[in-house]
């Protein structure tokens, strides 16, 4: 491991303030969603939001934690196996395969920290790696050599 | 701003080693990148990662911040404006368009803390959104109603 | 004024389908996810799933065996809850509920619709 | 999923008693628990959030205590607008489970 410096405030002043900054906007993805007329569909929309007009469309699932950082986190979740025509927005072309993107996000657990014999000293932050899908794509199937 | 209580551990313990684990690897997509033997050309393999593969291919840009957790952001861009036929995998095809998804992610700044007196007490952490293209989705243009 | 205002009662057949919708009033509807709970009569609040408005997000209860779905028209603030393959046992009053929240004390139910009655017979 | 248990299923007060309803979660949920009031014929209304901090305009003769699988609602000094039921949540997983409800009448 490698580490910041990290901020140990003098005695009276709160650590919690001066530590971490964290304002309650939820983390979801950034464009707005509008209804997709077939919520659950596998069809490419002409309006609404990138994951609903995609030849991959996908739905986000939540993913809460409560002792994580962020707690909110969104997992896309493919609604076709394979893409859909432009041609129709509807129906698939089985020459493309929707695949979802997988990416490592920077989370950050909170932990028991302990003071110098074992007592409890409030809480720690520890910072993981945590999978998370982010999007479906559509793509040439890998061809074997 | 609301807060999680933080860890100030007793003097002479290490605060750093306490407060974050934070190691040393970066956080790219999880996929390791083969070569693409047309690096930034407008056309989907048929082997490789996803962002070479997929129809609306993208490259990564990487950005780093010694400041930010985490140091190391990638960010997409679309090799083309439009999709790549999946037949051929290299015409484009001007019924779908090539379009970033972008995400709000979660980062932390370190900036100096100050002790009761605004003395320097090493750095704490300030939590922000920050702007980051994920990839790039292939996706039936709008129609404006 | 924060306002959530329900659609009307609804009579069913066993087997068909029900949507309820919620009109959001006196806050920023993206900013906050949008409960559902339903009290059949004389029993306890069953929590049925909630959305964030903002992307569609959800996350539903799965004992209700994949019958339920949940959308948002975020141009109208408005949230839908859409229940299918319906039994007499789904009789009840549909609750939709905003979810406040702080960063990590608490999420809770803090303005709540007035309730829509369904009555599956 | 989580269960929540509340006790008693009912009870029965009189103006001006401390009155105390607890609820018990199948297992450890921290903090994570919501108290709702709902009077006859009426909408649920939050009346306490993360174990004891007060919803907005909920009078202070009402306070909530715990941790971990135990907790407890208490009016301190009963009053006649006081009669309801009395739900507990939790929120630590998905999904969310409430208790069965405590009736509050007066005697």
């Known amino acids: 491991y490698s580490h910041w410096p990290s901020c140990c405030p003098s005695k009276g002043q709160d650590t919690s303030e001066e530590l971490l900054r964290w304002s309650t906007v939820p983390v979801p993805p950034l464009e707005p969603a509008r209804p997709n007329r077939h919520p659950e569909s596998c069809r490419a929309s002409e309006d609404g939001p990138l994951n609903s007009r995609a030849i991959s469309p996908w739905r986000y699932e939540l993913d809460r934690d409560l002792n994580r950082l962020p707690q909110d986190l969104y997992h896309a979740r493919c609604l076709c196996p394979h893409c859909v025509s432009l041609q129709t927005g509807s129906h698939m072309d089985p020459r493309g395969n929707s695949e979802l993107l997988y990416h490592n996000q920077t989370v950050f657990y909170r932990r028991p920290c302990h003071g110098e014999k074992g007592t409890h000293k409030g809480y720690c932050l520890e910072r993981r790696l945590y999978r998370v899908s982010l999007a479906c794509v559509c793509v040439r199937p890998r061809v074997m050599g | 701003y609301s807060h999680w209580p933080s860890c100030c551990p007793s003097k002479g313990q290490d605060t750093s080693e306490e407060l974050l684990r934070w190691s040393t690897v970066p956080v790219p997509p999880l996929e390791p990148a083969r070569p693409n033997r047309h690096p930034e050309s407008c056309r989907a393999s048929e082997d490789g990662p996803l962002n070479s593969r997929a129809i609306s291919p993208w490259r990564y840009e990487l950005d780093r911040d010694l400041n930010r957790l985490p140091q190391d952001l990638y960010h997409a861009r679309c090799l083309c404006p439009h999709c790549v036929s999946l037949q051929t995998g290299s015409h484009m095809d001007p019924r779908g368009n090539s379009e970033l998804l972008y995400h709000n992610q979660t980062v932390f700044y370190r900036r100096p803390c100050h002790g009761e007196k605004g003395t320097h007490k090493g750095y704490c952490l300030e939590r922000r959104l920050y702007r980051v293209s994920l990839a790039c989705v292939c996706v039936r243009p709008r129609v404006m109603g | 004024e924060v306002q959530l205002v329900e659609s009307g009662a609804e009579v069913k057949k066993p087997g068909a389908s029900v949507k309820v919708s919620c009109k959001a009033s006196g806050y920023s509807f993206s900013g906050y996810t949008m409960n559902w709970v339903r009290q059949a009569p004389g029993q306890r609040l069953e929590w049925m799933g909630l959305?964030?408005?903002?992307?569609?997000?959800?996350s539903y209860n799965q004992n209700f065996k994949g019958r339920v779905t949940l959308t948002v028209d975020t141009s109208a603030s408005t949230a839908y809850l859409e229940l299918n393959s319906l039994r007499s046992e789904d009789t009840g009053v549909y609750y939709c509920?905003?979810?406040?929240?702080?960063?990590?004390?608490?999420?809770?139910?803090?303005?709540w619709g007035q309730g829509t009655l369904v009555t599956v017979s | 999923d989580i269960q929540m248990t509340q006790s008693p299923s009912s009870l029965s007060a009189s103006v001006g008693d401390r009155v105390t309803i607890t609820c018990s979660a199948s297992?450890?949920?921290?903090?994570?628990l919501n108290w709702y009031q709902q009077k006859p014929g009426k909408v649920p209304k939050l009346l306490i959030y993360y174990t004891s901090s007060l919803h907005s305009g909920v009078p202070s003769r009402f306070s909530g205590s715990g941790s971990g699988t135990d907790f407890t609602l208490t009016i301190s000094s009963l009053q006649p607008e006081d009669v309801a039921t009395y739900y507990c949540q939790q929120y630590l997983a998905f999904p969310y489970t409430f208790g069965q409800g405590t009736k509050l009448e007066i005697k």
């Open positions: 959305i964030n408005p903002y992307n569609g997000g959800t």
């Open positions: 297992q450890g949920i921290s903090n994570y």
């Open positions: 509920a905003r979810e406040d929240f702080d960063s990590w004390t608490f999420f809770a139910m803090d303005y």
